[in-house]
C-alpha cells in the first residue's frame, strides 16, 4: 500500500487531466483527490496511465467507497474495470445496461473474464430475470453466453426473451438446455405462420419432442441434415420413413451420408427395410 | 458382381418408339432410385428422370416428359426407358445409373435414322 | 429449376500442374453436390459426392469443397490419366441437373 504523505506545494490536482501521468504514484495518492476523481471518471480512460497508476486510483476509489461504487462511477470506469476484483464487483448494484454496456465494451474482444461474469450475474440477478434488451446486449458481446448458462439459469428467461436469441447462439448449447429453451421458444413463436415460425424455431429444435416434430413434418419444412442432427434421439426414434420423409423434403438425400452418425444410425435400425426402400437411397438396416 | 448391364445399340427408325433396358444385379435393386441420362454425341450430360422400385415414384425432366416413361421390373430387376416419336435429336448414348451416382451403366446407343 | 453453371468450358494443363474446375448453382443446394469425370467412349466415373467427399478408389489428388451455390473441384499434380471431362451435378431433389462440362486436355 503507499505511505501517507502530503501532497507537495502547488501540485494538488484542480482537475483530472493529463498532467497526471507525469505524477509519481506516491503523489496520485496524495495529490488528486478521491472525490473529484469520482466525479471526473470519465476523464480517466482519455489519459495514458500506467498500470501502476491506475492502481492507485482504484485505491483512492476503495477507500471512498468502501461498500461498492455507486453507478454513477461504475458507469465510466473504463479501463479501470479491468483493474476490478469479483469480490470488488459483488458489492456493486448495477441496474442501468447503458452501465453494463460501457463495462462489456472494456472487455470486448476477450474471453469472458472473472470479472464480467460477476458483472454480468449481478446485473441480471438485479434485474430479476434475463429480459430481451439485456439477452441482446449480452449476445452481441459474447455468443455463447445463453449456452454458458445452467438449466436452472435458463429457466428464468422469459419467453418475451426467446426474441432475441440468433441461431449462433444456441451453437454450444447442450441438450439439457435446448430442453429448458425449447418450450419458452414454442411459446413465443406461437403466432407466425408455417414457414416463418420453422425458420425461428429451427435452432431450438434439438429440445423438441417427437409430437412436435411429427407436426412439423405435416408443413412442408424442409430441415437441412445439420438441423436434423442435433435433434434428441428419443425424439427422432419414434418417427416413420414417412414422416421423415416429409420433415426433410430434399434433404432425406443427406440421410446417406450420416447413415452411421447418431441420431440418423439408431433411427435407421429402428425401420423395416421395405420401410427405408421407400427412400431409394440405399440405406441398410 | 455389381453392375448395371445395358444393349450396346438400337436402331430405330424417325417416329418409331424404342424401349431401352438396363438390368441391375449385385445390389438390393429395390433399395435405390435408377436415373437415366441422356448424352448426345460430342455433348453434356442431361438428366431425364428417376423411377423409386419400390413406390413406383417418378420424376421426370419437363423436357422429356411428354416422351419418355420410366417403368421398373422388380422381378428381374430391371429398369426401363421408353421413347416415343423419335427423331434424329434422340440419338444419343443413354445411362441408366443408380442413385447415388457410384453406378453407371455403359450405355446404349440409340440411332435414329431412316 | 436449379441450373448449374460449370467453369472453364476447356482448359489445357500440363502433367504435375494442379487445376481448378468451379461449379455455381442457381440457388442454395446445401452441400447436395457431385462430381464426374469421363473419358472419350466411356461412362461417367464418380470422384466427389457430397461436395467434398471421395468416392471409393478415388485418388487423394482430388478434393471438392464449397457449400450453398458456390463449389469447386481441384485436382492436384495431374497425371496423364486425369485427363478427360469433368462435370458437376446437384443432388437436391429433381430435376437432377448437371452442368456443362469442362473439357481437360494436355498442354
Known amino acids: 500500500e503507499v505511505e501517507k504523505t502530503a501532497c507537495p506545494s502547488g501540485k494538488k490536482a484542480p482537475e483530472i487531466d493529463e498532467s497526471l501521468i507525469f505524477y509519481k504514484k506516491w503523489e496520485l495518492e496524495a495529490c488528486v483527490d478521491a472525490a473529484l476523481l469520482a466525479t471526473q471518471m470519465d476523464r480517466v480512460n482519455a489519459i495514458p496511465f500506467t498500470y501502476e497508476q491506475l492502481d492507485v486510483l482504484k485505491h483512492k476509489l476503495d477507500e471512498l467507497y468502501p461498500q461498492g461504487y455507486p453507478e454513477s462511477v461504475i458507469q465510466h470506469l473504463g479501463y479501470l474495470f479491468l483493474k476490478m476484483s469479483p469480490e470488488d464487483i459483488r458489492k456493486w448494484n448495477v441496474t442501468s445496461l447503458e452501465t453494463l454496456k460501457a463495462l462489456l465494451e472494456v472487455n470486448k474482444g476477450h474471453e469472458m473474464s472473472p470479472q464480467v461474469a460477476t458483472l454480468i450475474d449481478r446485473f441480471v440477478k438485479g434485474r430479476g430475470q434475463l429480459d430481451k434488451d439485456t439477452l441482446d446486449t449480452l449476445t452481441a458481446f459474447y455468443p455463447g453466453y445463453l449456452c454458458s448458462l445452467s438449466p436452472e439459469e435458463l429457466s428464468s428467461v422469459p419467453p418475451s426473451s426467446i426474441w432475441a436469441v440468433r441461431p449462433q447462439d444456441l451453437d454450444t448449447c447442450d441438450p439439457r438446455q435446448l430442453d429448458v429453451l425449447y418450450p419458452k421458444a414454442r411459446l413465443a413463436f406461437q403466432n407466425m405462420n408455417g414457414s416463418e415460425y420453422f425458420v425461428k424455431i429451427q435452432s431450438f429444435l434439438g429440445g423438441a419432442p417427437t409430437e412436435d416434430l411429427k407436426a412439423l413434418s405435416q408443413q412442408n419444412v424442409s430441415m437441412d441434415l445439420a438441423t436434423f442432427m442435433k435433434l434428441r434421439t428419443d425424439a427422432v426414434l419414434p418417427l416413420t420413413v414417412a414422416e421423415v420423409q416429409k420433415l426433410l423434403g430434399p434433404h432425406v438425400e443427406g440421410l446417406k451420408a450420416e447413415e452411421r452418425h447418431r441420431p440418423v444410425r439408431d433411427w435407421i435400425l429402428r425401420q423395416r427395410q421395405d420401410d427405408l426402400d421407400t427412400l431409394g437411397l440405399g440405406l441398410q438396416g | 458382381q455389381v453392375q448395371l448391364q445395358q444393349p450396346g445399340t438400337e436402331l430405330v427408325k424417325p417416329g418409331a418408339s424404342v424401349r431401352l433396358s438396363c438390368r441391375a444385379s449385385g445390389y438390393s435393386f429395390s433399395s435405390y432410385w435408377m436415373h437415366w441420362v441422356k448424352q448426345r454425341p460430342g455433348q453434356g450430360l442431361e438428366w431425364l428422370g428417376n423411377?423409386?422400385?419400390?413406390?413406383?415414384?417418378?420424376n421426370y425432366n419437363e423436357k422429356f416428359r411428354n416422351r419418355a416413361t420410366l417403368a421398373v421390373d422388380k422381378s428381374s430387376t430391371t429398369a426401363y426407358l421408353q421413347l416415343t416419336s423419335l427423331t434424329s435429336e434422340d440419338s444419343a448414348v443413354y445411362f441408366c445409373?443408380?442413385?447415388?451416382?457410384?453406378?453407371w451403366g455403359q450405355g446404349t446407343t440409340l440411332t435414329v435414322s431412316s | 429449376d436449379i441450373q448449374m453453371t460449370q467453369s472453364p468450358a476447356s482448359l489445357s494443363a500440363s502433367v504435375g500442374e494442379t487445376v481448378t474446375i468451379t461449379c455455381r448453382a442457381s440457388e442454395n443446394i446445401y452441400s447436395y453436390l457431385a462430381w464426374y469425370q469421363q473419358k472419350q467412349g466411356k461412362s461417367p466415373q464418380l470422384l466427389v459426392y457430397y461436395a467434398k467427399t471421395l468416392a471409393e478408389g478415388v485418388s487423394s489428388r482430388f478434393s471438392g469443397s464449397g457449400s450453398g451455390t458456390q463449389f469447386s473441384l481441384k485436382i492436384n499434380s495431374l497425371q496423364p490419366e486425369d485427363f478427360g471431362t469433368y462435370y458437376c451435378q446437384h443432388q437436391f431433389g429433381t430435376p437432377r441437373t448437371f452442368g456443362g462440362g469442362t473439357k481437360l486436355e494436355i498442354r
Open positions: 423411377i423409386n422400385p419400390t413406390t413406383g415414384d417418378i
Open positions: 445409373v443408380r442413385h447415388d451416382g457410384f453406378l
